[in-house]
């Protein structure tokens, strides 16, 4: 666990100032040998891999996406899975490895030359008629930050907050994710009482801006603890 690692958090072998491998405690994560890591249709073994629990793609690595490990599995149990390579099956952009996106259920290269026209097509296909889910994965139109040179303005489709312009974050809106304004002091925010609860929101709020945190409004007295209003407040 995090705390057990932190109780002995001194670095024994200092890394060089730049480059080289770090002698960071626990960098060789202990795991049972031969743990299989799903990637595309085949399984590959990743050294020292331990499945990481997640609620959304942003909690996983850049070469992963967040999903139930089994087809049609319990949507409440999600882990970070290896991204799908080109020509592998997909249901949303985040499932495809960096430099690829999901088109007609297949991961294809996000080649700058022909990408822009195709993505409009994909958005229409994904959202034109129905908003159902497949195999427990929610349909999303999300784009890799490597696909566009310009930062998304408010309302632009995104994959992660780094796709959005300064002062905006990438948050869920219906079955897509778009750039929304980062919350300011006094604005209502969402405090997730249990990990994974934000996976259920279809209108996700941004996080509080720099120097602010989401806390119970001091003057907001209600009988139920869970229904108290949370706002962005100074640290």
């Amino acid at each position: 666990t995090l705390n057990s690692v932190l109780n002995s958090n001194a670095i024994k072998n200092l890394p060089p100032p730049l480059g080289g491998a770090a002698g960071h405690p626990g960098s060789a994560v202990s795991a049972a040998p031969g743990i299989l890591y799903p990637g595309g249709n085949k399984y590959q073994t990743i050294d020292n891999y331990q499945p990481y629990p997640c609620a959304e793609d942003e909690e996983c690595g850049t070469d992963e996406y967040c999903a139930s490990p089994t087809r049609g599995g319990d949507a409440g149990v999600q882990i970070c899975l290896a991204c799908r390579k080109r020509r592998k099956r997909c249901m949303r952009h985040a499932m495809c490895c960096p430099g690829n996106y999901c088109k007609n259920g297949i991961c294809v290269s996000s080649d700058q030359n022909h990408f822009r026209g195709e993505i409009e097509e994909t958005i229409t296909e994904s959202f034109g008629n129905d908003h159902s889910t497949l195999d427990g994965y929610s349909r999303r139109t999300t784009l890799s930050s490597k696909m566009y040179h310009t930062k998304g303005q408010e309302g632009s489709v995104c994959l992660r907050s780094s796709d959005c312009a300064s002062g905006l974050c990438c948050a869920r809106h219906f079955w897509s994710k778009i750039c929304k304004p980062v919350l300011k002091e006094g604005q209502v925010c969402t405090k997730h009482r249990r990990k994974g609860s934000h996976g259920l929101e279809i209108f996700q709020r941004c996080y509080c801006g720099e120097g602010l945190s989401c806390r119970i409004q001091k003057d907001h007295h209600q009988a139920s603890n869970s229904s108290r209003l949370h706002t962005c407040q100074r640290h």
Epitope: I46, E58, R160
Partner: nanobody, 125 residues
Framework: EVQLVESGGGLVQAGGSLRLSCTAS????????VGWFRQAPGKERDFVTA????????AYADSVKGRFTISRDNAKNTAYLQMNSLKPEDTAVYYC??????????????????WGQGTQVTVSS
């Protein structure tokens, strides 16, 4: 390769605040985990806090929980460490470090491949 430069260190009185910045150049910053570490005179370098590529996950050493806040702005290729309620025992050279965030794991268990030169933080009583 990623080059990291820390700034914002200095001398502050106990109870005061400082905000450190770690600015990156080179490889894509937005795909890296960023950590802050500190080294007091005669001691080993310790983990302080870390943040994943998206900012969705953070971790803190017990000694700084509730006082320090890590954040990042990928558009500016910069990570921040807001340090409040500083104590004399927070005196150290603070280093920022970055590592590839391809596969999620405990934020204390990343291999930090690139390191800044450090910035001195001195807290007087």
């Amino acid at each position: 390769e990623v080059q990291l430069v820390e700034s914002g260190g200095g001398l502050v009185q106990a109870g005061g605040s400082l905000r450190l910045s770690c600015t990156a150049s080179g490889s894509a910053f937005s795909s890296h985990v960023v950590g802050w570490f500190r080294q007091a005179p005669g001691k080993e370098r310790d983990f302080v806090t870390a943040i994943n590529w998206s900012g969705a996950r953070t971790a803190y050493a017990d000694s700084v929980k509730g006082r320090f806040t890590i954040s990042r702005d990928n558009a500016k290729n910069t990570a921040y460490l807001q340090m409040n309620s500083l104590k004399p025992e927070d005196t150290a050279v603070y280093y920022c470090a970055a590592g590839r965030d391809r596969y999620a794991r405990d934020l204390t268990e990343y291999e930090y491949l690139w390191w800044g030169q450090g910035t001195q933080v001195t807290v007087s009583s």
